[in-house]
Interface confidence: low
Amino acid sequence: LSPQPGAGHDEGPGSGWAAKGTVRGWNRRARESPGHVSEPDRTQLSQDLGGGTLAMDTLPDNRTRVVEDNHSYYVSRLYGPSEPHSRELWVDVAEANRSQVKIHTILSNTHRQASRVVLSFDFPFYGHPLRQITIATGGFIFMGDVIHRMLTATQYVAPLMANFNPGYSDNSTVVYFDNGTVFVVQWDHVYLQGWEDKGSFTFQAALHHDGRIVFAYKEIPMSVPEISSSQHPVKTGLSDAFMILNPSPDVPESRRRSIFEYHRIELDPSKVTSMSAVEFTPLPTCLQHRSCDACMSSDLTFNCSWCHVLQRCSSGFDRYRQEWMDYGCAQEAEGRMCEDFQDEDHDSASPDTSFSPYDGDLTTTSSSLFIDSLTTEDDTKLNPYAGGDGLQNNLSPKTKGTPVHLGT
């Protein structure tokens, strides 16, 4: 790992440089303000549950601007190449316990491919505990539960989302590492499709059990703003969305799934350079509060409300929004204090508190619907073999195999 920054200072650069406020080097899209789901600057994805095409309805976002982030989920710190801390944030996968490192041979030999991986711990993403993620060859991790055709649109952790083709070179690998407290994905010596002469990229994303997310960049051979997005989106940052079901106007008995991006952090691509790193530290969210008192007395920047029937604290903007609406939580919480709930039957229509909107029919439906024809808008294919066939448990040179292609 050279050059190794030594004397420039470790934590210095990121210091105090947070997404909470107008910050140099970051553009925050004004997507997270509370309000009606249909507000015009939200990104919406819609999909017929009947297996129809997924349309991405992005309404004109002419309010995109650098804004003060008054709805923060993460504090973000950038460490420049002259920061020793950027070196410290790099996880040396080659030095890790071999049994915890896996070369994903399918991802390492193909282009526009994605594969599900199960974590050994619950990773809190925007306050939601996740056990499964989807690694894509295109330099990002899809964090959604429901696989759809537009993985690159939202619900991602993207150290550098671009049109990478690990299949171009035998030296290119997609490696991941899980030691029970951190999960690291490394895109190692990967080349941009059509831009192979620029050289190889090596970078990683680390998901820590405490919710921290680290992007570390070892080799970035070209200026990121110069990377073409004509064939594949180019993004660096985080995004999350919630999914709601509503009746389809065309087929009344069917339900249409819509995905709404409620928060996004975008890193200025010019800041992505060799030996730099970005660390996202999660801020408290409403979801962490387990009682009405804690919820209503929360001094978070979020407007937390308590839903008695769900026994859940929420701002209404998280992945459980469907339940929040279905159980009338928005209306229930309006103007009510915790004392107002004291006399109510604690068990009335109370579902399992660990229930998520993806736990029931939705997951089952989506799995059977998509598993045979899974392509994203950039033609990233899902590889269902999360374990076993697609993996090597060591760091020996990868062998070229026949790539598994799903869909068309």
Epitope: P3, H9, D10, G12, G16, S274, M275
Partner: antibody, heavy 117, light 111 residues
Framework: EVQLLESGGGLVQPGGSLKLSCAAS????????MSWVRQAPGKGLEWVSG????????YYADSVKGRFTISRDNSKNTLYLQMNSLRAEDTAVYYC??????????WGQGTLVTVSS | QSVLTQPPSVSGAPGQRVTISCTGS?????????VHWYQQLPGTAPKLLIY???NRPSGVPDRFSGSKSGTSASLAITGLQAEDEADYYC???????????FGGGTKLTVL
């Protein structure tokens, strides 16, 4: 307004010691790495030493390693440079600077250290 | 001998454009490390002029601009004014030495 105010400079004999201080205000001191940069009379700038936000990590130029010690007291918003075994070539104006993203965003007015017999 | 090389002096008439070069090597500027520029007016402390190769802190006139290519960088000053007369220093990071490094400084004289 960000202010960095150095003090403690003066005339000292070769082999002697001196302790420089830098009082910081106008920003959250513990959020920033800090550095000392010096400038010999009529010469250019030379990075001397740096310290991480919490003070756990310290860094030195080869020319001062083993003789100078950088430290900080975040409760007092103060940066220090303990200089021992001073030499004539250490004569310079010493600046403390706030460090961010690889550059020195704010500088103090400097304090002159003269090493002479 | 400074790690980064700058011309000792440059000069220009008011209103003219001048450039100051800063040449490094493959272990600093050429390795991709950012270049920063400082202005030091006579008898005062250095002031950050350009950071991250091309960015101006608030309060710095847009007459000042920075660029970087390969192992060198340059500072351009357009519409030269008398108050621009000062010493200018470039700074980067050297991965081999493991330290912040400065250029030797360039004295700008406004004729």
């Amino acid at each position: 307004e960000v202010q960095l105010l150095e003090s403690g400079g003066g005339l000292v004999q070769p082999g002697g010691s001196l302790k420089l201080s830098c009082a910081a205000s106008g920003f959250t001191f513990s959020d920033y790495a800090m550095s000392w940069v010096r400038q010999a009379p009529g010469k250019g700038l030379e990075w001397v030493s740096g310290i991480s936000r919490g003070g756990a990590r310290t860094y030195y130029a080869d020319s001062v390693k083993g003789r100078f010690t950088i430290s900080r007291d975040n409760s007092k918003n103060t940066l220090y440079l303990q200089m021992n075994s001073l030499r004539a070539e250490d004569t310079a104006v010493y600046y403390c600077a706030r460090y961010l993203f690889g550059h020195y965003m704010d500088w103090g007015q400097g304090t002159l250290v003269t090493v002479s017999s | 001998q400074s790690v980064l090389t700058q011309p000792p002096s440059v000069s220009g008439a008011p209103g003219q454009r001048v450039t100051i070069s800063c040449t490094g090597s493959s272990s600093n500027i050429g390795a991709g490390y950012d270049v920063h520029w400082y202005q030091q007016l006579p008898g005062t402390a250095p002031k950050l002029l350009i950071y991250g190769n091309t960015n101006r802190p608030s309060g710095v006139p847009d007459r000042f601009s920075g660029s970087k290519s390969g192992t060198s960088a340059s500072l351009a000053i357009t519409g030269l004014q008398a108050e621009d007369e000062a010493d200018y220093y470039c700074q980067s990071y050297d991965g081999r030495l493991g330290v912040s490094v400065f250029g030797g400084g360039t004295k700008l004289t406004v004729l």
